[in-house]
Interface confidence: medium
């Protein structure tokens, strides 16, 4: 079978998931694609405990997560229900602000410097976090 018991090399294991923290920036769509190319997805935050774990690793840096409303309603990239799920927005957010002068509103969610969430222009080159469930994650280091 394809079940895995450990995280890929240089990913961090936490509560049956594996996480990879970027050190460079990408637009949301590119970050989303990059996680998918790891057979993973942008991080989906489902609890306060997971929020604290991610926040601890990213520090006070704007960082994309797997939440967007580019097609209307807010959606998590893995299908987790947004309405009934965990949320940690900053006060007054999300506000779909149009005043940035970059065209359009704000359709992608990111962790802000204090860990709370904000919606922002999806083209901004923020860091990102990939997540994959542990029973899907590769257990062996790459062979070279």
């Amino acid at each position: 079978g394809s079940e895995r018991t450990c995280c890929p090399v240089n990913w961090v294991e936490h509560e049956r998931s594996c996480y990879w923290f970027s050190r460079s920036g990408k637009a949301w769509a590119d970050a989303d694609n990059y996680c998918r190319l790891e057979d993973a997805h942008l991080v989906v935050v489902t609890s306060w405990e997971e929020q604290k774990f991610v926040q601890h690793h990213i520090g006070p840096v704007n960082t994309w997560m797997g939440l967007h409303d580019q097609n209307g309603p807010w959606k998590w990239v893995d299908g987790t229900d947004y309405e009934t799920g965990f949320k940690n927005w900053r006060p007054e957010q999300p506000d779909d602000w149009y005043g940035h002068g970059l065209g359009g509103g704000e359709d992608c969610a990111h962790f802000t410097d204090d860990g709370r969430w904000n919606d922002d222009v999806c083209q901004r080159p923020y860091r990102w976090v990939c997540e994959t469930e542990l029973d899907k994650a590769s257990q062996e280091p790459p062979l070279l």
Partner: antibody, heavy 122, light 107 residues
Framework: QVQLQQSGAELARPGASVKLSCKAS????????INWVKQRTGQGLEWIGE????????FYNEKFKGKATLTADKSSTTAYMELRSLTSEDSAVYFC???????????????WGQGTTLTVSS | DIQMTQSPASLSVSVGETVTITCRIS??????LAWYQQKQGKSPHLLVY???NLADGVPSRFSGSGSGTQFSLKINSLQSEDFGSYYC?????????FGSGTKLEIK
Amino acid sequence: QVQLQQSGAELARPGASVKLSCKASGYTFTNYGINWVKQRTGQGLEWIGEIFPRSDNTFYNEKFKGKATLTADKSSTTAYMELRSLTSEDSAVYFCARKGRDYGTSHYFDYWGQGTTLTVSS
Amino acid sequence: DIQMTQSPASLSVSVGETVTITCRISENIYSNLAWYQQKQGKSPHLLVYAAINLADGVPSRFSGSGSGTQFSLKINSLQSEDFGSYYCQHFWGTPFTFGSGTKLEIK
């Protein structure tokens, strides 16, 4: 040792379809993506797409969407690429390659098949 | 899509010389670049990954350098078995484009 063994040369008619195979051995098949690369005679390398056998997730170069379909069979550790509506432009050598990975998202194609020559002619 | 400009297209050199092949990228790809060697009628062979790391079994006369948008592959003291074609390839999102190649020929 890691090996990618590709199927033999193919001769096909214009408009037909072909299915090329890439049999993987020597490593855990579901842990790595399999990529396909096209090379026309005397030309450079062109990335077609990638499949993750673990999840069957696929990624395609826009240029090859509708032309190539990637699949993988976990039980036989074999990846496949079907090419449809063949024309002379599809005549090329097609390589499969394993995408290795090091420290997070640094990728590279670390092992390659020997290539399959496809000739499209009437 | 990310554009790759590889130069020179061809190079005629003698055994023992040193050559440098460059790859210029249209946007910042950090260190997400690999180099391959391909001999006539054979599959490509990984030389360098993550811009600077030598793959297993690759002789130390090969070295990769660069980051961001400008990368180089240097071959010191060329040997007869080094002749062939060389390609760079980025891994900064799809499509994983290759450079157009550099053909290294014996003078």
